[in-house]
């Protein structure tokens, strides 16, 4: 073992650097004094730190900590910020453009519905931005609304125009019969099951990225114990004490140090690690019926489709309902709440169909991918936080909390701790309450996303292939898939020049009903390139 | 003629029960949500709860919730709402109001005409 | 949930035009959500005048009319009339979809 080198007999180096820690030389020493009332820095024999020292250093070792610890987490905080807020802009993009879509399908093929539909249009996807935004909004509810409200405006607008407008019974009547009558077939039930699936899919993946970033806040801002700031104060600034300003802590024992430090915060690597697989899980099933982008930007075909259903069968209603709501006023205005269970033919399953370029899913992988290279992030943090700090090299001439040493020995190490404090007794003492309730965070998100998760996962699946479809089940023709019999139906290629081209010039944003909705931004273009290839109902 | 009519106000004390009710004549009862809302003596409107259509969303004001419990039966066109634990500050006139909408709470077309709830020792 | 606010009292005289304001925050009236206005006389049930921020039910008269910009939203009434003279209150529901009111603004005809 080398003698120690000579102690600075002045403390002069010691006062020069703890000056710039805090202005003004009261507390240090001016030469080596016994230091008897130390209690971090514990004395092999005179010292130039004071007991006020000491606790400058360990408040200083803890501001350190803490921020070593943000700097770690700088670049994965950034990257789930980053993404949660082009996703959210992204589906409320979606969502605008369905609703121009639904609107302008109205507008070319419905005008005479226009004024009332748009409203109805409105409200339903003012309600789809809610439910992905979090609102507690039952879908079949939201669809059920539509149709409802559509039904008697396509009854006395289209198939009945000689009515009377005063007919408010009737329309009562009709919103009845809607339902009691299946006028829209199987359509409405084919909605709920398309939106329901792709809307609960894309409200869990916003849900799992801004838990996120909730996890890593809580870890960026977490007080370090007493405990710890006692290991890194004796880590970085003991070594100060005995004038020793240019050695460095030696790399195993950094690690030791961290490792104690961080045990309640490793304590989440294992759910850290299930969230990003599970989120994988997730976005490896987002295509098809599991992708609002799909589904939304499909939906104006499905209601233009239930609306010619309607109107294929009109003579027969048309008498059904004239002997239903001829006396409106006295009938008991009473319908059930029906399930529909007639068989879906796979070509009713009309989901517009992706190209996939630089869509929403390529950026959902994209995500992934970078997410996944951060999996380690949590049992790393002990490392990659001694790796950013001042270590010695090959752990040679170094400082091991006591004394400098030619090679650190982690038993030497331990059993000079002993006498100070258990490191062992600081791993055992478990997470810090935040922690916890973090981690119980994550449980709950991942067994959601593991419940999400397609295809086993998926229990609605089953249901699908019992009523005669597959999700998203096209063949190799994709016009099987897509939506767009009728007139005013044309396909736009690239979706994301899809948000220059769709039309803002088309006044539908401006109808009565839409009036909260926000207007495209500019930045909308560059949000997130090029979504792909959508069925437009753009003339 | 589109009616809703409430019942089952009274005086009650403070902690104990009722149960309002309120029968909707004249519409689909069943394809829109359905609201209660209070006017306390002299003040202004509080929304109470709200239920949609289907009966699976509830929606319930702060200070109610956990107390009061609002339910349907769309085969008897009637909406309810229990409340329990009464207070002082429950007293008030209770509305039904029926909703322009299916899915959840949004504006409130049609009211009945108010049953007063007195909450005393 | 908070109440949205509007002010106490509004008056004008017949014929006159009066504005009320409502004034909520970004998760409610500010956010996806829509804004009815109601009217209310002393010892009867409110009734509905405006909904979905601008639209009238029918037989609302037109001189009744709603906008709404960011957190505010306004209910204007052109051409006031004796029968005007009543309790207003705006509504909307935040993002939770719980509904909340405004306190109420008495109009007087003077």
């Known amino acids: 073992q080398p003698p120690p080198p000579p102690p600075d007999a002045t403390c002069h180096q010691v006062r020069s650097f703890f000056q710039r820690l805090q202005p003004g030389l009261k507390w240090v020493p001016e030469t080596p004094v016994p230091g008897s009332d130390l209690q971090v820095c514990l004395p092999k024999g005179p010292t130039c730190c004071s007991r006020k020292m000491e606790e400058k250093y360990q408040l200083t070792a803890r501001l350190n900590m803490e921020q070593l610890l943000q700097s770690a987490s700088m670049e994965l905080k950034f990257l789930i910020i980053q993404n949660a807020a082009v996703f959210q802009e992204a589906f409320e993009i979606v969502v605008r453009h369905a609703k121009n879509y639904t609107n302008a399908m109205f507008k070319n093929n419905y005008p005479s519905l226009t004024p009332q539909a748009f409203e109805f249009v409105g409200e339903f996807f003012t309600d789809v931005s809610l439910y992905i935004l979090g609102s507690d909004i039952n879908v079949d509810d939201m669809v059920n609304e539509l149709f409802d409200s559509l039904f008697p405006v396509i009854y006395t607008q289209l198939m009945n125009p000689g009515l009377p407008d005063s007919a408010l019974d009737i329309n009562e009547c009709l919103r009845g019969a809607r339902r009691d009558l299946k006028v829209f077939g199987n359509f409405p039930k084919l909605i709920m099951t398309q939106v329901s699936k792709s809307l609960q899919v894309t409200r869990i993946f916003l849900q799992a990225l801004n838990l996120g970033i909730e996890v890593i806040n809580t870890t960026d801002h977490l007080k370090f114990s007493k405990d710890c700031g006692r290991m890194l104060t004796r880590m970085w600034y003991c070594s100060y004490c005995q004038g020793l300003m240019m050695v460095k802590p030696c790399g195993g024992y950094c690690n030791v140090v961290m490792q104690g430090c961080m045990a309640g915060v490793v304590e989440i690597d294992k759910y850290w690690r299930e969230y990003i697989l599970s989120l994988e899980e997730l976005v490896n099933g987002m295509y098809r019926i599991y992708d609002m982008e799909n589904v939304l930007l499909g939906l104006f075909s499905t209601i233009h489709d239930s609306i010619q259903y309607v109107q294929k069968n009109a003579g027969k209603l048309t008498t059904t309902i004239g002997k239903l709501c001829a006396h409106s006023q006295q009938r008991q205005y009473r319908s059930a709440y029906y399930p529909e269970d007639l068989f879906i033919d796979k070509k009713v399953l009309k989901v517009a169909h992706v190209e996939h370029e630089e869509t929403l899913s390529s950026r959902r992988r994209e995500l992934i991918q970078k997410l996944k290279s951060f999996i380690s992030f949590y049992s790393a943090l002990p490392g990659y936080i001694c790796s950013h700090s001042p270590v010695a090299e090959n752990d040679t001439l170094c400082w091991n909390g006591q004394e400098l040493v030619e090679r650190y020995s982690q038993k030497a190490a331990r059993n000079g701790m002993k006498n100070q404090f258990n490191l062992h007794e600081l791993k055992m003492k478990g997470p810090e309450p935040v922690v916890s309730q973090i981690i119980d965070k994550l449980k709950h998100i991942n067994q959601l996303l593991r419940t999400m998760s397609m295809p086993k996962g998926r229990v609605l699946d089953k249901n699908l292939d019992e009523e005669g479809f597959e999700s998203g089940d096209c063949g190799d023709d994709e016009d099987e898939c897509i939506g767009g019999s009728g007139d005013g139906m044309i396909k736009v290629k690239n979706q994301l020049r899809f948000l220059a081209e769709l039309a803002y010039d088309l006044d539908v944003d401006d109808a009565p009903g839409n009036s909260q909705q926000a207007t495209p931004k500019d930045n909308e273009i560059s949000t997130f390139h090029n979504l792909g290839n959508v069925h437009s109902p753009l003339k | 003629q589109v009616q809703l009519q409430e019942s089952g106000g009274g005086l009650v004390q403070p902690g104990r029960s009722l149960r309002l009710s309120c029968a909707a004549s004249g519409f689909t009862f069943s394809t829109y949500a359905m609201n209660w809302v209070r006017q306390a003596p002299g003040k202004g409107l509080e929304w109470v709860s709200a239920?949609?259509?289907?009966?699976?969303?509830?929606y319930y004001a702060d200070s109610v919730k956990g107390r009061f419990t609002i339910s349907r039966d769309n085969s008897k066109n009637t909406l309810y709402l229990q409340m329990n634990s009464l207070r002082a500050e429950d007293t008030a006139v209770y509305y039904c109001?029926?909703?322009?909408?299916?899915?959840?709470?949004?504006?409130?077309?049609?009211w009945g005409q108010g049953t007063l709830v007195t909450v005393s020792s | 949930q908070s109440a949205l606010t509007q002010p106490p009292s509004a008056s004008g005289s017949p014929g006159q035009s009066v504005t009320i304001s409502c004034t909520g925050t970004?998760?409610?009236?500010?956010?996806?959500?829509?804004v009815s206005w109601y009217q209310q006389y002393p010892g009867k049930a409110p009734k509905l005048l405006i909904y979905g921020n601008s639209n009238r039910p029918s037989g609302v008269p037109d001189r009744f009319s709603g906008s709404k910009s960011g957190t505010s939203a306004s209910l204007a009434i052109t051409g006031l009339q004796a029968e005007d003279g009543a309790d207003y209150y705006c509504?909307?529901?935040?993002?939770?979809?719980?509904?909340?009111f405004g306190g109420g603004t008495k109009v007087t005809v003077l």
């Open positions: 109001a029926k909703d322009r909408r299916g899915s959840h709470a949004d504006a409130f077309d049609v």
């Open positions: 509504q909307s529901y935040d993002s939770s979809l719980r509904v909340v």
């Open positions: 970004s998760s409610d009236v500010g956010g996806y959500n829509y």
């Open positions: 239920i949609s259509m289907s009966g699976e969303s509830t």
